[in-house]
């Protein structure tokens, strides 16, 4: 739970954040997990700790391993683990899957590609961007802050994009590269006022106390890629995240494209261990886009367990 994978290339800078947060945090100590040896904080070392961050300047293949961070405060100490893998640089242009960050999707209206992990580094603009190892040139490509903007996106723009920047530490410069895939969504389509397919307006959903319950909010917004479309749940008019009940969480479902080609979204509301007080809440399925917002309200009712007589 408190472990995080991090990876980098040899001879590049790699900065890793402790996956455990203090509440509050006074100091963070880092150790090599295998030897329990403390990692120094002096910046003259190639590998050193700096608060929540562990810095490899530059990284070496031999640095691979598990690192322990302990977030200390007067009350409680919290332990996290960073699983670090440093790879040799590939001689060819191919970027292997294990070096790829999460894929992002874009469309004609929205084509930002963020440079992964860049927030951890002390870098200055501009970023260099490459697609399939070729430096990006031409007025369609604009490096802006920590992301790349592509104008008039076409399907041919799909591919692997690498950002390259320089991390500066006490006057010394270190190179960093990070790669992620970019996919292009079809933009042919139109947008409608949201249509909520489920739940029905003022639906009563039967649930069993003590059991888990799922409510699905499903809505369609038009055809093709939608510039702004969202489905979400509210409890008594409050966002789930603000309601502060950990038993009730929302989870994004799959983007759906029905046979008629409509672009639809699902949001599942999961209620763990249904309690009596959950029956008193108003559950609103909200669907919104540029045309407006539609709301369907659901209430829960107790399902009476059926008596089975022999």
């Amino acid at each position: 739970k408190f472990s995080k994978q991090s990876w980098g290339l040899e001879n590049e800078a790699l900065i890793v954040r402790c996956p455990r947060q203090g509440k509050p945090s006074y100091t963070v100590d880092w150790y090599y997990s295998q030897t329990n040896k403390s990692i120094p904080t002096q910046e003259r070392n190639r590998v050193f700790a700096s608060g929540q961050l562990l810095k490899f300047l530059p990284a070496a293949v031999a640095d691979s391993g598990i690192y322990t961070c302990i977030v200390r405060s007067p009350t409680f100490n919290r332990t996290g683990y960073a699983n670090v893998t440093i790879y040799k640089k590939q001689s060819d242009c191919n970027v292997p899957d294990y070096l790829m960050y999460s894929t992002v999707s874009g469309s004609e209206k929205n084509s930002k590609i963020y440079c992964p992990t860049i927030d951890l580094y002390n870098w200055t603009a501009p970023l260099e961007w490459f697609k399939n190892c070729q430096a990006l040139q031409g007025s369609r490509y604009r490096a802006h802050k920590s992301f790349l903007v592509i104008d008039n996106v076409m399907t041919e723009d799909a591919g692997d994009y690498t950002c390259k920047f320089i991390h500066n530490e006490n006057g010394a410069n270190y190179s960093v590269t990070a790669t992620r895939s970019f996919t292009v969504k079809d933009e042919q389509g139109f947008s409608l006022f949201p249509v909520i397919g489920a739940p029905a307006q003022n639906e009563i959903k039967e649930v069993e106390i003590g059991k888990n319950a799922n409510l699905t909010c499903s809505a369609c917004f038009g055809k093709g890629t939608q510039f702004l479309a969202a489905v979400l749940w509210q409890l008594n008019g409050t966002k789930i995240t603000d309601f502060g009940e950990p038993r009730i969480q929302q989870e994004e479902g799959q983007n759906q494209s029905f046979s008629n080609g409509l672009a639809c979204l699902d949001m599942v509301l999961r209620i763990a261990d249904v309690k009596e007080e959950d029956l008193l809440l108003q559950y609103d399925c909200l669907a919104l886009n540029l045309h407006g917002l539609r709301r369907h309200t659901v209430r829960l009712s107790r399902k009476n367990p059926i008596d089975h007589h022999s």
Epitope: Q21, G22, K23, P24, S25, Y26, T27, P74, T75, F76, R78, D242, F243, G244, P246
Partner: antibody, heavy 118, light 112 residues
Framework: QVQLVQSGAKVKKPGATVKISCKAS????????MHWVQQAPGKGLEWMGA????????VYAKKFKGRVTITADKSSSTAYMELSSLRSEDTAVYYC???????????WGQGTLVTVSS | DIQMTQSPSSLSASVGDRVTITCRSS???????????LYWYQQKPGKAPKLLIY???NLASGVPSRFSSSGSGTDFTLTISSLQPEDFATYYC?????????FGQGTKVEIK
Amino acid sequence: QVQLVQSGAKVKKPGATVKISCKASGYIFIDSEMHWVQQAPGKGLEWMGAIDPETGDTVYAKKFKGRVTITADKSSSTAYMELSSLRSEDTAVYYCTGSTTDYYFAYWGQGTLVTVSS
Amino acid sequence: DIQMTQSPSSLSASVGDRVTITCRSSKSLLHSNGIIYLYWYQQKPGKAPKLLIYQLSNLASGVPSRFSSSGSGTDFTLTISSLQPEDFATYYCAQNLELPFTFGQGTKVEIK
């Protein structure tokens, strides 16, 4: 917005046990330590102890150790403070208070008055 | 335990006055991380304390800029540059350097 709502005032006899609840909302309960602070009538503030709701780990002030038990129920985002072997000097307002990433005692409950009287 | 001593225990002032409250700790509140773990709270009758200042000199969210705090490792000062009607309350200093966390005995600011 963040809210800590405590249970109502209680009157107890010497030797009895009192249990106060503190229901949190507006933030992720397990992401904040919960502390308890005592304030006797006309007196100052005294730290009693704390819990990390994520792990259930607790820490107590020496003065209250052995008499105080702090617990947390993640499912209802509620923290509890139980004080046993009550005596008249335990008559006080008890506050629950939550921490943030930057500091302790960021949010406070409205307080619960406990009166110990025979 | 770290002792926190405030002075004065009470003071009378008028709206617009500059008010200074001092707090002394029995041990330096300077942590090895360079932060001084000194806090100030305001409490009004029948209400819960409210955080004013954290880590010596940082204003908590929503606190007016007329409140300020300064000090070294053991001697601290809370200043209200121009006292407002809503500032009449009791003020507590506290340390969060080490357990047990301790508070000063409070300074009551009353209307003259």
